[in-house]
């Protein structure tokens, strides 16, 4: 049987992207990161 036409089946979840920079002291420079949904990924 042929398939009935449906969408891709993948749901889109909208999440907040937060870029941040954190000063960790003059001798260590800064950490720059990207947080997606509360998890730091970069």
């Amino acid at each position: 049987d042929a398939e009935f036409r449906h969408d891709s089946g993948y749901e889109v979840h909208h999440q907040k992207l937060v870029f941040f920079a954190e000063d960790v002291g003059s001798n260590k420079g800064a950490i720059i990161g990207l947080m997606v949904g509360g998890v730091v990924i970069a």
């Epitope: 042929a2 398939e3 009935f4 036409r5 449906h6 969408d7 089946g9 993948y10 749901e11």
Partner: antibody, heavy 122, light 112 residues
């Protein structure tokens, strides 16, 4: 709110062509993913899916009836029309239209018309 | 065509008691997109069918939580935790994964 209503002749003669119209409100067939199906139910029997038309004019048919069926839509009138040729007494049934939108969480026939009863007899 | 087989054909129930309807498909109804388009509809006496459950286990808007759907592959079940008088009618399972979509023969639920 979403409503659908079927209309057509209550009685047709064998060999004649049946034309049914589904007039709907509360949604548009120009909306991406939207579609309308026709389903029938002979007296005291189960449901049988007949055909479906999508917002982009793609249509699907039940292979067992494909040679007899044509489904079309008039988006401006909010109508879907089903024609069935060479009617036979076994086609006596209540005919329903129902909407199904495939690009949504609820991908199912979520709203149905009240049905129209068609008797095939000479 | 995919054949949908429902059991039992008739189900007499006592109000307040649970009820269960089985539906089996003649082959897998998992769509290539990963979803299983198994639906349950209720046709109350003299009315049009109405959607209860979609994609195996999701309750449609306004459907009481006493209704639940489960299953996978080819074996599916509709359960009513506590049957009420308004639940009487014919229940149909339907697969919408392949053409043509096909319905089960129906299960008539009636009050004892």
């Amino acid at each position: 709110q979403v409503t659908l209503k079927e209309s057509g002749p209550a009685l047709v003669k064998p060999t004649q062509t049946l034309t049914l119209t589904c007039t709907f409100s509360g949604f548009s067939l120009s909306t991406s993913g939207m579609g309308v199906s026709w389903i029938r139910q002979p007296p005291g029997k189960a449901l049988e899916w007949l055909a479906h038309i999508y917002w982009d004019d793609v249509s699907l048919y039940n292979p067992s009836l494909k040679s007899r069926l044509t489904i079309s839509k008039d988006t401006s009138k909010n109508q879907v029309v089903l024609t069935m040729t060479n009617m036979d007494p076994v086609d006596t049934a209540t005919y329903y239209c129902a909407r199904r939108r495939i690009i949504t969480v609820v991908d199912a026939m979520d709203y149905w018309g009240q049905g129209t009863t068609v008797t095939v007899s000479s | 065509d995919i054949v949908m087989t429902q059991t039992p054909l008739s189900l007499p129930v006592t109000p307040g008691e649970p009820a269960s309807i089985s539906c089996r498909s003649s082959q897998s109804i998992v769509h290539s997109n990963g979803n299983t388009y198994l639906e349950w509809y209720l046709q109350k006496p003299g009315q049009s069918p109405q959607l209860l459950i979609y994609k195996v286990s999701n309750r449609f808007s306004g459907v009481p939580d006493r209704f639940s759907g489960s299953g996978s592959g080819t074996d599916f079940t509709l359960k009513i935790s506590r049957v009420e008088a308004e639940d009487v009618g014919v229940y149909y399972c339907c697969q919408g994964s392949r053409v043509p979509p096909t319905f089960g023969g129906g299960t008539k639920v009636e009050i004892k």
